[in-house]
């Protein structure tokens, strides 16, 4: 069963990969980045259903395309190069979901822009917060 | 209303330079990319670049790298089109387009600018 | 450099249903648009991101794609729907975009 500090460790690093998915949307959905309307000619995939820490199996699967979609902002509204916040995303995705199991990711037909795929993702964190408080 | 507006038919001759104009109207020119379409006689349409008003940023086609060049006065709302030494195969109806602001397509077209080279 | 192969052309009976193809190596991870051209006229957006339809362009026409493969398909085709159709993408650098060749749709 989890402990009370497990849950704590858990809920922040949900708030961290949360806090760091906000800063790539508010970085990209700046208005004085040009880019934004070239980034959304890329697809992202969806979870079919996304309400446990395992699904974010299909978050980590799309990160790498999403650092691709990330080296074209070449913005300024990120405090790290592409490459080092998406590795520090991995890393949360990674303790979050856990390795002991291996779960397919299971996809959506419908794919998504990166401002809607972000989004997504936002809200999972906050769902899983709010159960977790 | 939101509408770009082109120059007038042109006819030159080889060598000669040119330079064509889309006036836009309607809508911030300075926050959407503006893109050139060629479409040559009886042929489809071929994309040649985009530049972004705002600051400037262009991105050409392979194809027409170093053929032509594409640039924006945004005082005056209007990109432009420019060859320094026009040839026969030049000959084509030029498009400009905007690429629309939330789903990156060519949204708004020009009415075109047909451009002939003869000798 | 990225190319776009769509059908030269194709044919269909009045209110028959009419597709068209466009393949590219690129599809999986970006989108497609589809342009309808009727003669001596500019390009007009009729699909956007694969599978949406601007406002104001008929519910007969429908897009999708899966794997290297985008289809528009226009159900109970009008005379009035002859045209070139052209799918448009960019390659995966974001920097470059295509046209396809183009299809000639016929009704008749």
């Known amino acids: 069963a989890p402990t009370s500090s497990s849950t704590k460790k858990t809920q922040l690093q949900l708030e961290h990969l949360l806090l760091d998915l906000q800063m790539i949307l508010n970085g990209i959905n700046n208005y004085k980045n040009p880019k934004l309307t070239r980034m959304l000619t890329f697809k992202f995939y969806m979870p079919k259903k996304a309400t446990e820490l395992k699904h974010l199996q299909c978050l980590e699967e799309e990160l790498k395309p999403l650092e691709e979609v990330l080296n074209l902002a070449q913005s300024k509204n990120f405090h790290l190069r592409p490459r080092d916040l998406i590795s520090n995303i991995n890393v949360i995705v990674l303790e979050l979901k856990g390795s002991e199991t291996t779960f397919m990711c299971e996809y959506a037909d419908e794919t998504a822009t990166i401002v809607e795929f972000l989004n997504r993702w936002i809200t999972f964190c906050q769902s899983i917060i709010s159960t977790l408080t | 209303q939101v509408q770009l507006v082109q120059s007038g038919a042109e006819v030159k001759k080889p060598g000669e330079s040119l330079k064509i104009s889309c006036k836009g109207s309607?809508?911030?020119?300075?926050?959407?990319?503006i893109g050139w379409v060629r479409q040559m006689p009886g042929k489809g349409l071929e994309w040649m670049g985009i530049?972004?008003?705002?600051?400037?940023?262009?991105r050409y086609s392979p194809s027409f790298q170093g053929q032509v060049t594409i640039s924006a006065d945004k005082s005056i709302s209007t990109a432009y089109l420019q060859w320094s030494s026009l040839k026969a195969s030049d000959t084509a109806m030029y498009y400009c387009?905007?690429?629309?602001?939330?789903?990156?397509?060519?949204?708004?077209w020009g009415q075109g600018t047909m451009v002939t080279v003869s000798s | 450099s990225y190319e776009l192969t769509q059908p030269p052309s194709v044919s269909v009976s009045p209110g028959q249903m009419a597709t068209i193809t466009c393949s590219g190596d690129?599809?999986?991870?970006?989108?497609a648009y589809w342009y309808q051209q009727k003669s001596g006229q500019a390009p007009v957006l009729v699909i956007y991101?694969?599978?949406k339809r601007p406002s104001g362009i008929s519910e007969r026409f429908s897009g999708s794609s899966s794997g290297t493969v985008a289809t528009l398909t226009i159900t109970g085709a009008q005379v009035d729907d002859e045209a070139d159709y052209y799918c448009?993408?960019?390659?995966?650098?974001?920097?470059?975009?295509?046209f396809g060749g183009g299809t000639k749709l016929t009704v008749l």
């Open positions: 690129a599809l999986p991870r970006k989108y």
């Open positions: 309607g809508y911030s020119f300075t926050s959407y990319w």
């Open positions: 387009a905007r690429l629309s602001g939330s789903y990156s397509a060519f949204d708004i």
């Open positions: 448009f993408s960019t390659d995966l650098s974001g920097d470059r975009s295509v």
């Open positions: 530049i972004y008003p705002g600051d400037s940023d262009t």
């Open positions: 991101e694969d599978s």
